[in-house]
Amino acid sequence: RGVFRRDAHKSEVAHRFKDLGEENFKALVLIAFAQYLQQCPFEDHVKLVNEVTEFAKTCVADESAENCDKSLHTLFGDKLCTVATLRETYGEMADCCAKQEPERNECFLQHKDDNPNLPRLVRPEVDVMCTAFHDNEETFLKKYLYEIARRHPYFYAPELLFFAKRYKAAFTECCQAADKAACLLPKLDELRDEGKASSAKQRLKCASLQKFGERAFKAWAVARLSQRFPKAEFAEVSKLVTDLTKVHTECCHGDLLECADDRADLAKYICENQDSISSKLKECCEKPLLEKSHCIAEVENDEMPADLPSLAADFVESKDVCKNYAEAKDVFLGMFLYEYARRHPDYSVVLLLRLAKTYETTLEKCCAAADPHECYAKVFDEFKPLVEEPQNLIKQNCELFEQLGEYKFQNALLVRYTKKVPQVSTPTLVEVSRNLGKVGSKCCKHPEAKRMPCAEDYLSVVLNQLCVLHEKTPVSDRVTKCCTESLVNRRPCFSALEVDETYVPKEFNAETFTFHADICTLSEKERQIKKQTALVELVKHKPKATKEQLKAVMDDFAAFVEKCCKADDKETCFAEEGKKLVAASQAALGL
């Protein structure tokens, strides 16, 4: 039962234009272009989008018109390759244009940059934003899509349309409010934070598909959907997994029109069949399309059916285990994963996948043994340590978080991870450790039954950020090893890393620890980042420094910043007191 239309269309571009409507078509083409050509000015992209849209309209009017039968990759690739400054701006990416489809699109995909050299987005004054919004609402919203898409080249395009809709609603409401800032700023903060989280989650899905293949993604999807829809039958979950895999494969592959169209079809199918999927979908299914799709993606787990039978009966005690496994290995393992996941909403998806991998490895070994049943009879006993490891880790870290609070917990992780992989760039270590530290406030408040899925699956998303950033400029074999060996064992791999004894400490550079009065005007978050940057650098200079030594230096540093920010002549204070601080810190750390 495939939900996607299989009928051939003379013109793919006309088909998608009609399905999606002009507004969504234009928005998705803009996102696609901005995600490919991340450095191009906004105006250039708008021009390209308008040209593609006009062409699509001619195809809607006559599907047999010239070039209307071309694939979307061909049409879009040809359009991107008309950009005059391609070689100057993008260097070797221009070589993609010499290739034919599908190699050309693959080439563009390979040149997507997870960390583009773009200025930080600075939020203008509220009045300035509201004026811009009222002056030209369409351009204002397009600019939002463009700025997010070019900074997040794997952002889930149909979900970005949903963010843009909320962005528009926020300005529509708040620009008429008495206190515009009080109304608008919290909404924008929420959209920014949710947007970053959404981008990171999607980046993991794309990494899963691109680095580990469709089978890995499908396994993830079986586990997650089985937790979410435990009343659905295996055939239903399998069907949803197949369709969801198609949607994400398309989006990760830059096929954004097909992706958005198929996602809408999938939401429609789910809502038409909610009786056999989940009792929690009713509210979602009453919403408009973009909200509906988002709501379904975030829907809470349905209640587990009563009277679920023992898993051991079919997967351990049965004499037919090896026969069933041999007949259809992936289907049998899929059923195992489905049955285990629907019984364990309290487990992380990655833990469930580790259990399934252990089960698979055991069957591979035992089904070739003289007495298979005797060999695999104790397989469930092998699960115990795998379950206990994340449980214990989460317990310990939540205790540490509750004791320290978020900022100091982040600092503890900064020190821990800098010692594990000191070769990684300081900005990456700061960004990743800060995000790892957010697991505390995000997950430790939950009861035991929700902690592990919250924490470990979130950590998978954050560690993927480390992996994709490191892949761009690899500097550590240990990071490469943890990132590439096993998707589901990334977190245990990083957790198991000890201090890198081979690391040669960084030469001391006073400039790194020189601060100026501008730190006083920074937001609390920015000030924390400055201090955390200094902490990473300290550890890189002195990897063997003790917690106590580092704490003492950081306390002195905090006091120094506070003192100088209160001084009349701030800059002089920073210059003079800064020298003293550096000298004292060197002495304290024996540098």
């Epitope: 295996f234 009277d307 679920l308 039978p309 023992s310 898993l311 051991a312 009966a313 079919d314 997967f315 351990v316 005690e317 049965s318 004499k319 037919d320 026969k323 069933n324 059923m335 049955e339």
Partner: antibody, heavy 121, light 111 residues
Framework: EVQLVESGGGLVQPGGSLRLSCAAS????????MGWVRQAPGKGLEYIGI???????YYASWAKGRFTISRDNSKNTVYLQMNSLRAEDTATYFC???????????????WGQGTLVTVSS | DIQMTQSPSSLSASVGDRVTITCQSS????????LSWYQQKPGQPPKLLIY???DLASGVPSRFSGSGSGTDFTLTISSLQPEDFATYYC???????????FGGGTKLTVL
């Protein structure tokens, strides 16, 4: 009272289809594999197949393709769908509860009274 | 297909007699012991007497016993009672659940 009750039998023409039901009461079907066995008039017992607690199905070679066993744990019922029926399928059809959960041990310790299926034109 | 051969196919005996019925399979049963015995009376469903070759099912009198391993099995009734006159079937479980099979039956009648 713990019991199994078959229903859905009757007269059917050759080539026709029939769906038999087996309703359990006094216990949950989700804890055991459930099998179907038939007995032609005056003849011996013949194994048709079984469905495990997790829904895995196993059929005698002669039954594969024509007969399908399914279960609905929420209704505490097991079904036997029979297609392309022939005169030689005329028999009393029993459902039975196996001692095992995940496979057929051949040890059925609870049986229904059976339902008669007659295939005739 | 796996064959289960029961002998004799019919047997006459008197109350108090010791009776033995044998069952032979064309292949070894699973774990060498997955063999059951049933009793069936006219108009009734079968009743499980013995499972795993020698284990007595719940509520079955101790005059019934089973033995054997691999391919050869025996059901023994140590002292026939009037209610024991019925048809007896063996059933074997094999390495695949698809291969479960019943013997042809042994009809035990009053001499």
């Amino acid at each position: 009272e713990v019991q199994l009750v078959e229903s859905g039998g009757g007269l059917v023409q050759p080539g026709g289809s029939l769906r038999l039901s087996c309703a359990a009461s006094g216990f949950s079907l989700s804890s055991n594999a459930m099998g179907w066995v038939r007995q032609a008039p005056g003849k011996g017992l013949e194994y048709i197949g079984i469905i495990s607690v997790g829904g895995f199905t196993y059929y005698a070679s002669w039954a594969k393709g024509r007969f399908t066993i399914s279960r609905d744990n929420s209704k505490n019922t097991v079904y036997l769908q029979m297609n392309s029926l022939r005169a030689e399928d005329t028999a009393t059809y029993f459902c039975a509860r196996d001692r095992h959960g995940g496979d057929s041990s051949g040890a059925f310790y609870l049986w229904g009274q059976g339902t008669l299926v007659t295939v005739s034109s | 297909d796996i064959q289960m051969t029961q002998s004799p196919s019919s047997l006459s005996a008197s109350v108090g007699d010791r009776v033995t019925i044998t069952c032979q399979s064309s292949e070894s049963v699973y774990s060498n012991n997955q063999l059951s015995w049933y009793q069936q009376k006219p108009g009734q469903p079968p009743k499980l007497l013995i499972y795993d070759a020698s284990d007595l099912a719940s509520g079955v009198p101790s005059r019934f016993s089973g033995s054997g391993s691999g391919t050869d099995f025996t059901l023994t009734i140590s002292s026939l009672q009037p209610e024991d006159f019925a048809t007896y079937y063996c059933a074997g479980g094999f390495s695949s659940s698809s291969d479960t099979a019943f013997g042809g039956g042994t009809k035990l009648t009053v001499l």
